[in-house]
Interface confidence: low
């Protein structure tokens, strides 16, 4: 039976240019992690393999820093960057668990709500 | 808007501990994330640590197992407890938090004998 439970950042905001942590946590459960997948929509951004570290996608790796822990930390961000990332952990034996984050980025300084910040 | 000020800063002996506050006014962290970053002089600056609503933690390895990253919804305020510190942690410290809009004036942090 899955019992574990992924805590988000949930629906955050970014300016344009500027830079954001993504961040999930999975709690609740003794299964093991054996990846976790990084995607926006239907493309995949990046991997980290417990036994074989991260793997950045090549389209992505100018952009994409891994970290903090499981987390992942976009730069340089566009009104393209907006919409639907997913962390998915793969345990055992659990199985599978997905958490949701929504991004807006935004052209004005006028990102209102969300867990945002600037990296100069 | 948001407004974010840090304190708690100052000179300390290496070896020694300080904590950090940071007030949000205007719009709450009512959740999400909160995180504390530093910039050293002539450096980029850095995340240092990072926790999320329900009170999962996240530090930069140069950190962990010295320094405590905590938030209180209820006050608005996130803290940076950091004991054991070096020389190396010379820096201002930055928080940021849900709606934030430009940085905080920081507060500064010197380890120094």
């Known amino acids: 039976m899955m019992t574990g439970t992924i805590e988000t950042t949930g629906n955050i905001s970014a300016e344009k240019g500027g830079s954001i942590i993504l961040q999930c946590h999975l709690s609740s459960t003794t299964a093991q992690v054996t990846q976790v997948n990084w995607e926006q929509q239907d493309q995949l951004l990046a991997i980290c393999n417990a036994d074989l570290g991260w793997h950045i996608s090549p389209s992505f790796k100018d952009r994409v820093a891994p970290g903090p822990g499981l987390g992942l930390t976009l730069q340089s961000l566009t009104v393209n960057d907006t919409g639907e990332y997913f962390c998915i952990y793969h345990t055992y034996p659990d199985g599978t668990y997905t958490g949701r984050i929504f991004l807006e980025v935004l052209e004005s300084s006028v990102a209102e709500h969300g867990a945002r910040f600037q990296i100069p | 808007e948001v407004q974010l000020v840090e304190s708690g800063g100052g000179l300390v002996q290496p070896g020694g501990s300080l904590r950090l506050s940071c007030a949000a006014s205007?719009?709450?962290?009512?959740?999400?994330?909160m995180g504390w970053f530093r910039q050293a002089p002539g450096k980029e600056r850095e995340w240092v640590a990072s926790?999320?609503?329900?009170?999962?933690?996240w530090y930069a390895d140069s950190v962990k197992g010295r320094f405590t990253i905590s938030a209180d919804n209820s006050k608005n305020t996130a803290y940076l407890q950091m004991n054991s510190l070096k020389p190396e942690d010379t820096a201002v410290y930055y928080c940021?938090?849900?709606?934030?809009?430009?940085w905080g004036q920081g507060t500064l942090v010197t380890v120094s004998s």
């Open positions: 940021t938090t849900e709606g934030f809009d430009p």
């Open positions: 205007g719009n709450t962290f009512s959740g999400g994330f």
């Open positions: 926790v999320l609503r329900g009170g999962y933690t």
